[in-house]
Interface confidence: low
Amino acid sequence: IPVIEPSGPELVVKPGEMVTLRCVGNGSVEWDGPISPHWTLYSDGPSSVLTTTNATFQNTRTYRCTEPGDPLGGSAAIHLYVKDPARPWNVLAKEVVVFEDQDALLPCLLTDPVLEAGVSLVRLRGRPLLRHTNYSFSPWHGFTIHRAKFIQGQDYQCSALMGSRKVMSISIRLKVQKVIPGPPALTLVPEELVRIRGEAAQIVCSASNIDVDFDVFLQHNTTKLAIPQRSDFHDNRYQKVLTLSLGQVDFQHAGNYSCVASNVQGKHSTSMFFRVVESAYLDLSSEQNLIQEVTVGEGLNLKVMVEAYPGLQGFNWTYLGPFSDHQPEPKLANATTKDTYRHTFTLSLPRLKPSEAGCYSFLARNPGGWRALTFELTLRYPPEVSVIWTSINGSGTLLCAASGYPQPNVTWLQCAGHTDRCDEAQVLQVWVDPHPEVLSQEPFQKVTVQSLLTAETLEHNQTYECRAHNSVGSGSWAFIPISAGARTHPPDEFLFTP
């Protein structure tokens, strides 16, 4: 830690005297802060010397010396008083700026420590301090107003009693700024606007700030609009409101409107888009595919997005068939408004039954007319398999019918012994039917295919299984002929239900 000579901590001299302050450290040392021109500064090895041949009251202040190389960052200080009977105060700054609730140091330094007992703080021209002004005094630093308030932003003077008269310092202006937490708060109403050409419209841009020093403007595309500003103060905030009123809109009024407000902390901006249209419009769309496939027993939500101006005058969901004349229950239909001109309509179809496959239409109406959006709902089914023994053109044949959706694939398995299902170890042969015959393929219904296995391939006392599968699941049916071609209808005990 550096050492200052003389040792201090205070040194009192008279005006005109010579003053020498020497700072000595282990390494190089330096004096802190701005050194006034009245001082001569020179270095002498590990010491730094400040000297003046003609001390004045303006040299009154604390001089601090530091050793930059010191890892502990220590410093030494000495306070110099130049006691001038005519000048009891040395004011270091004529203006002090703080934020509310900070301590404000008014740097009027006493030039003579003896005068400390008779000091006081007053407002300009001797006016008393405002009530509740909490302050303290330090001869080294000046007066501190604690937790300064906005209203305490005034001109102050430091007063010292010299004999029987009070001697005032030059005035110090205290500016107390409100704490600005960020850019002004903004609202731009509405968030989006649509009007038909010739209609009236209004856009309101409002900003609020903790103090009055902020700017707000409304901009159309790249043009700042000249709009009268209405100012107000409520809820402890300053409000500025710009209202753009358009009696009859035209296409040139369309575009992007930005409400922009700025203060010392920065700027805040919010935008909205104004569309001007020739006539009423009504657009229906869906993010979903209009052709839907769902597994039977599962649920589905059908969603339609509506963009409309003016607003809807009516809407509903309708089941168009083909199976029953049921209509969707109103409780299963839900409407949500995303914003003024966009709505989402949802139809919930829980635990779908085969009779609920088909077409569902959403209809909406506004002054622009009617629009409809139709979904086609097909149910997916796992395959159902049946096998029969029949004679075709005099030959014994196994027929397998598989019904499901999507269309099932068919595979025949031959396995040893009698079983209701061929497992991997028992399989002797596998036949894949690449092109089963399509028996029926009606809209919104299962697809039924048929596969044939002829008698010459059949062997006595073996199990034949027809297996079908699709994306939903699989099904199978096993059959055991007693002797190839011996019977048209084998006994019931040889039919195995999967």
């Epitope: 700026v97 704490v179 600005i180 930005s258 700025s262 010392v264 902390q265 935008s271």
Partner: antibody, heavy 121, light 107 residues
Framework: EVQLVESGGGLVQPGGSLRLSCAAS?????????WAWIRQAPGKGLEWVSS????????YYADSVKGRFTISRDNSKNTLYLQLNSLRAEDTAVYYC?????????????WGQGTLVTVSS | DIQLTQSPSSLSASVGDRVTITCRAS??????LAWYQQKPGKAPKLLIY???SLESGVPSRFSGSGSGTDFTLTISSLQPEDFATYYC?????????FGQGTKVEIK
Amino acid sequence: EVQLVESGGGLVQPGGSLRLSCAASGYSITSGHHWAWIRQAPGKGLEWVSSISGSGSTTYYADSVKGRFTISRDNSKNTLYLQLNSLRAEDTAVYYCARGSYYGAGSFDYWGQGTLVTVSS
Amino acid sequence: DIQLTQSPSSLSASVGDRVTITCRASQGITSALAWYQQKPGKAPKLLIYDASSLESGVPSRFSGSGSGTDFTLTISSLQPEDFATYYCQQYYPWPWTFGQGTKVEIK
């Protein structure tokens, strides 16, 4: 006239630390404007590094320096600081301190002359 | 982060020429854009703020325009002291970013 003078730059090894200072004269750093450090790698463009709000209560950092650099100020000395820790070769640049302009908010109307930081082993 | 792309990256012009530099933002930044001039070895100097407002003391031959994503700096009649590098900077939102710069050289 506002004057900003940076100091504290120099040669430092990777992983090392530096403290940059920016002494303001002709204007109090507590007077509401925000302050920032902006850097420029040799032969490259400008990169915003950090800002401190007018009240000193809010600080912002570029992702590239978050957790390594700290912006601060000493109102009594009217000085802005940038503490640089865990320095990397890519931190080599001239570091400018700048004052945020009032009307332009995030634009910078006064700049210092810059101080060069070289990170090299 | 918002990217600013300046074009061209460099240009050659003669004294008296009209020069236009563009700056495109990767997303809308309203009018929160500034333009700076920087000469070798010197700190940047603010020319335009809020996309089109001329900074005090800057010659009127400099002008800015644009909003949203596309901005332009125009020097109506290039002077010898205008040969420098020009940068755009956006300040809405954080983090603030600069364009890569446009160098204006003597033809």
